[in-house]
């Protein structure tokens, strides 16, 4: 969690002189309670906005907006503490709006906003606006909190942000996977414009289960510049296990900006549909059983094998 740049942050508006300060998230009104405290914020809204740094990088930010209740307690409002808690790491960042002049009632409701908290793709935040001074220990709470879930890098607007681009969001491999026969799977995808290697991770599952019955990893060497943006195809050899028919193919790139932590893309091939109606039983019995060409439990190809081509 951080603030966007360290440029001058503004909270003044017509009729109010205000300054934005860093906060320890522990306003001194906790320690020295006041008798008269303002009511809580009204209509707290958090939206996803995007902002450029002075260096030109684009980051997702939490746009926080709230209004004041139209009661006499605004006469005792000395400011607000904005707090953002990142749920998964319990990291908290606060800023304080310090009012340097007293608020007066006017015809339009007072409205405040702040758009400088940089948020991470796919993360969840609790945003709290606390009016200051905070209430005495048994007083009614004068804060409002809301949760804010930031979309991940698959989201169209997020894709072009600096953190998402750094993890490879602009690469669309357009994966196609097809079963050639019971033992071969063909994977096609588009290479990105970087000389970096890829890994194809194949995980196979039984029809209705989540425990894998086969795993195979295939390495694709870095393409040459003339192969950038071209389709690459790989044929993977499956382990011939009966019922091991649902295949998940994941492609992991190793771009220089994200190394082994780049966004992965995946595609799944479902098990073939079982026929709804049973096969008709012939009205004669064959005199011999047809011989199967291969055993259902073939053990000599545990590792799986593969070959690949780049197409221009």
């Amino acid at each position: 969690l951080r603030l966007l740049d360290h440029r001058a942050l503004v909270c003044s508006q017509p009729g109010l002189n205000c300054t934005v300060k860093n906060s320890t998230c522990l306003d001194d009104s906790w320690i020295h309670p006041r008798n008269l405290t303002p009511s809580s914020p009204k209509d707290l809204q958090i939206q996803l906005h995007f902002a450029h740094t002075q260096q030109g990088d684009l980051f997702p930010v939490a746009h926080i907006e709230w209004t004041l209740q139209t009661d006499a307690s605004i006469l005792y409002l000395e400011g607000a503490e904005l707090s953002v808690l990142q749920l998964n790491t319990n990291e908290r960042l606060c800023v304080k709006f310090q009012f340097l002049s007293m608020l007066q009632h006017h015809r339009k409701r007072w409205r405040f906003s702040f758009s400088h908290f940089v948020v991470d793709p796919g993360q969840e935040y609790e945003v709290t606006v606390h009016h200051l001074p905070k209430p005495i220990p048994d007083g009614d709470p004068n804060h409002q909190s809301k949760n804010f879930l930031v979309p991940d890098c698959e989201h169209a607007r997020m894709k072009v942000t600096t953190p998402c681009m750094s993890s490879g969001s602009l690469w669309d491999p357009n994966i196609t996977v097809e079963t050639l026969d019971t033992q071969h799977l063909r994977v096609d995808f588009t290479l990105w414009n970087e000389s970096t290697h890829y890994q194809i991770l194949l995980t196979s599952f039984p029809h209705m289960e989540n425990h894998s019955c086969f795993e195979h990893m295939h390495h694709i060497p870095a393409p040459r510049p003339e192969e950038f943006h071209q389709r690459s195809n790989v044929t993977l050899t499956l382990r011939n296990l009966k019922g091991c028919c649902r295949h998940q193919v994941q492609i992991q790139p190793f771009f220089s900006s994200c190394l082994n932590d780049c966004l992965r893309h995946s595609a799944t091939v479902s098990c073939p549909e079982m026929p709804d109606t049973p096969e008709p039983i012939p009205d004669y019995m064959p005199l011999w059983e047809p011989r199967s060409g291969s055993s259902d439990y073939k053990d000599d190809d545990d590792k799986g094998s593969s070959h690949h081509h780049h197409h221009h």
Epitope: N88, N90, S145
Partner: antibody, heavy 118, light 107 residues
Framework: EVQLVESGGGSVQPGGSLRLSCAAS????????MNWVRQAPGKGLEWVSI????????HYADSVKGRFTISRDNAKNSLYLQMNSLRDEDTAVYYC???????????WGQGTTVTVSS | DIQMTQSPSSLSASVGDRVTITCRAS??????LAWYQQKPGKFPELLIY???TLQSGVPSRFSGSGSGTDFTLTISSLQPEDVATYYC?????????FGPGTKVDIK
Amino acid sequence: EVQLVESGGGSVQPGGSLRLSCAASGFTFSSYSMNWVRQAPGKGLEWVSIISSRSSIIHYADSVKGRFTISRDNAKNSLYLQMNSLRDEDTAVYYCARPKVGGGMDVWGQGTTVTVSS
Amino acid sequence: DIQMTQSPSSLSASVGDRVTITCRASQGISNYLAWYQQKPGKFPELLIYAASTLQSGVPSRFSGSGSGTDFTLTISSLQPEDVATYYCQKYNRAPFTFGPGTKVDIK
């Protein structure tokens, strides 16, 4: 001293209810999200639920969704887990745990035992 | 939901040995991974967070590495007091799933 103390465990029949409590001391409870984690006898750890500092974010494991309710009272420095429609597989030691700033859970209670059996 | 797997499920090693436990996430979780040690009859204790940051008070023989989907906990020189079950946990976003655990004992 930073401390978490769970209570409210006991024996209950399938379909019954229990309410677990966790009393926190030694830190600013209202600044932290809080978790419940459980461990069935002889099994591994299972994350159960999390509640954010101001209760605006709550998540549950699929295995307890719709049956368990997490809540907190910051004025009392207390965390709760209301468990309804209990099943045999809910038998476990239940821990409350505080997340560390930066990730993971660095403060755990001693646990309270819940036994669901007919 | 993202699945967490650990290997091996158990291991025996001699005092002084280098021990390595691996944890794999079914999808990338960046470095949002923690490791815990749990001794029999005790509550778990945090060893490593953010995949590689040592929790204060934890001996330096413990170390963590990895990012994305593959993570490793290493005990550089196994000590008798390290007999325990070790769990990884992902916390990129809820649910904050634990791995199934690796039981470590002394040969």
